[in-house]
């Protein structure tokens, strides 16, 4: 059918509560495109009827709520004027009772469910709520070890729990609960978060600076080997991770089988005020499918990308 396949990372989700996934893939979805969701390679699209438990809402697939049997691979097909991309998303649903067990044993929990507070600082936790505009969210309540959090040190502000003067006792199992209203019906969203405490200053308001790349394209011949450095300056005491991603997935995971594109070993040079970090990405052999994809260097909250481009033909 001429659609290019793109495989996203697995999503591990809790049953009996709402879940939504947005089919966005810059730069594909930035122009005039149509998006259609399918389940398990079915030829029949996911319903767009808002009363359906599972339905497409603009570019989103929305589960109201998600059920144990909804596990599987979902595809969203993005069709442009002269392009077609099929994005595969593997959703794994588990039964979870947050107050019965620790969430530490869950496989591959994303960063949204593992968060860090910095000892002795004022810091915050975030309740990640990703839903389309048709879903009205709130109010948010926060729990620690299944007891509602109260007290002068804690303030709920937007989707965050502000924690002043973080102490070692603040580590543990948290949950944020929000009421989601959709078409007059109410649902409960409950996200468990494992919180650890670090003594390193880390995110002290300083944001890592990506010196290179600078959101640009690189001309490279098909079949050649390419190495691109990501150069980042950051504070000496930072706790930020630096990595290369494609399609929101670590390149080493994305190209796990072929190992054609790999992330290098990080190195750093220490200066008096800051560190300069370098982590490269190696394309052993540039293939046609690499062109036009944003390869993203991430450093904490900072990102920058390169896009590979075929050199313009030389008519000399």
């Amino acid at each position: 059918d001429g659609c290019k396949d793109i495989f996203m990372k697995n999503e591990i989700l809790s049953a009996s509560q709402p879940f939504a996934f947005n089919c966005t893939f810059p730069p594909i979805t930035s122009g005039e495109v149509s998006v259609t969701w399918y389940k398990n390679s079915s030829k029949i699209p996911v319903s767009k009827i808002i009363q359906s438990r599972i339905h497409q809402d603009e570019t989103w697939i929305l589960f109201l709520p998600m059920e144990w049997g909804d596990s599987g691979v979902y595809q969203c097909v993005i069709k442009g004027r002269d392009s077609c991309h099929r994005i595969h998303v593997n959703l794994t649903v588990f039964e979870k009772h947050w107050c019965d067990t620790s969430i530490g044993g869950l496989p591959n929990l994303s960063d949204e469910y593992k968060q860090i507070l910095h000892l002795g600082k004022d810091d915050s936790l975030t309740c990640h709520l990703h839903f389309p505009k048709s879903c009205v969210l709130g109010p948010i309540k926060w729990y620690k070890d299944c007891n509602e959090i109260k007290g002068e040190r804690f303030t709920v502000l937007e989707t965050r729990l502000l924690v002043s003067n973080v102490s070692a006792e603040d580590r543990g199992n948290y949950a944020c609960q929000a009421i989601l209203t959709h078409s007059g019906k109410q649902y409960e969203v409950l996200n468990g978060i494992t919180v650890s405490i670090t003594e390193r200053a880390g995110y002290g308001g300083s944001v890592p600076k990506i010196i290179y790349p600078k959101n640009h394209s690189i001309e490279v011949q098909l079949g050649t080997t390419l190495i691109v450095d990501c150069n980042v300056t950051d504070t000496k005491d930072n706790t930020n991770l630096r990595c290369w991603r494609v399609n929101n997935t670590l390149v080493d995971d994305y190209y796990d089988e072929s190992k054609r594109i790999r992330e290098g070993v990080e190195t750093h040079v220490s200066f008096r005020e800051h560190n300069l970090y370098t982590v490269n990405i190696t394309f052993l052999e540039v293939k046609m499918e690499d062109y036009g994809l944003p390869f993203m260097c991430h450093a904490g909250v900072s990102t920058a990308y390169i896009i590979l481009q075929l050199p313009a033909p030389d008519f000399r």
Epitope: S124, I140, L162, G300
Partner: antibody, heavy 120, light 112 residues
Framework: QVQLVQSGAEVKKPGASVKVSCKAS????????MNWVRQAPRQGLEWMGM????????RLNQKFKDRVTMTRDTSTSTVYMELSSLRSEDTAVYYC?????????????WGQGTLVTVSS | DIVMTQTPLSLSVTPGQPASISCRSS???????????FYWYLQKPGQPPQLLIY???NLASGVPDRFSGSGSGTDFTLKISRVEAEDVGVYYC?????????FGGGTKVEIK
């Protein structure tokens, strides 16, 4: 639609107290913090604090912590802000304000303002 | 407390022309959750302020699309693509990364 209606202008003597009310309608009163922001004549905006109408959370700007009390009357969906030990520099328009939604900040809804004049 | 500094203090603009206001915060407002807790307000003469932009670049409900917000963690810009007579007033930037919430000193925009 969301509406915040404040009490009328007040003239007070230095050392006195003033209590400004803000009556809310058009939404679930107990779901949202009520914020108070003041603006001295020809000056900028200054956040005073916020109060949750369930009554158990007040967060004040340290500048006002000894002089401001926030209370509510749930039966009438009204929040009150009392400022004590008034001085001439407290002359200002006092606004109550509510956030855009429960998960998005920024004050999308404001009262019309209450002018408090402190003069001997 | 986070200090918000606005420039210029005042601005005189010809109708139909673009305008730009800047604001700088003393601390990065970009949270590690990738949200920037930064806002723009407009206070028209004799009225309470109105929200224009939330979380740095999102247009508040009912705000004309001639307004746009952009920035980094500490440096922010409000652009008006074509100024209209109704855009006069004082523009304020604000942060709600942390308490106390703080506002910039304001930029007065008037029509030439």
């Amino acid at each position: 639609q969301v509406q915040l209606v404040q009490s009328g202008a007040e003239v007070k003597k230095p050392g006195a107290s003033v209590k400004v009310s803000c009556k809310a309608s058009g939404y679930t009163f107990t779901n949202y913090y009520m914020n108070w922001v003041r603006q001295a004549p020809r000056q900028g905006l200054e956040w005073m604090g916020m109060f949750h109408p369930t009554g158990d959370v007040t967060r004040l700007n340290q500048k006002f912590k000894d002089r401001v009390t926030m209370t509510r009357d749930t039966s009438t969906s009204t929040v009150y802000m009392e400022l004590s030990s008034l001085r001439s520099e407290d002359t200002a328009v006092y606004y109550c304000a509510r956030t855009t939604s429960m998960i998005i900040g920024g004050f999308a809804y404001w009262g019309q303002g209450t002018l408090v004049t402190v003069s001997s | 407390d986070i200090v918000m500094t606005q420039t210029p203090l005042s601005l005189s603009v010809t109708p139909g022309q673009p305008a730009s206001i800047s604001c700088r915060s003393s601390k990065s407002l970009l949270h590690r959750n990738a949200i920037t807790y930064f806002y723009w307000y407009l206070q028209k003469p004799g009225q309470p302020p109105q929200l224009l932009i939330y979380q740095m670049s999102n247009l508040a409900s009912g705000v004309p699309d001639r307004f746009s917000g952009s920035g980094s963690g500490t440096d922010f810009t409000l652009k008006i693509s074509r100024v209209e007579a109704e855009d006069v007033g004082v523009y304020y930037c604000a942060q709600n990364l942390e308490l106390p919430l703080t506002f910039g000193g304001g930029t007065k925009v008037e029509i030439k």
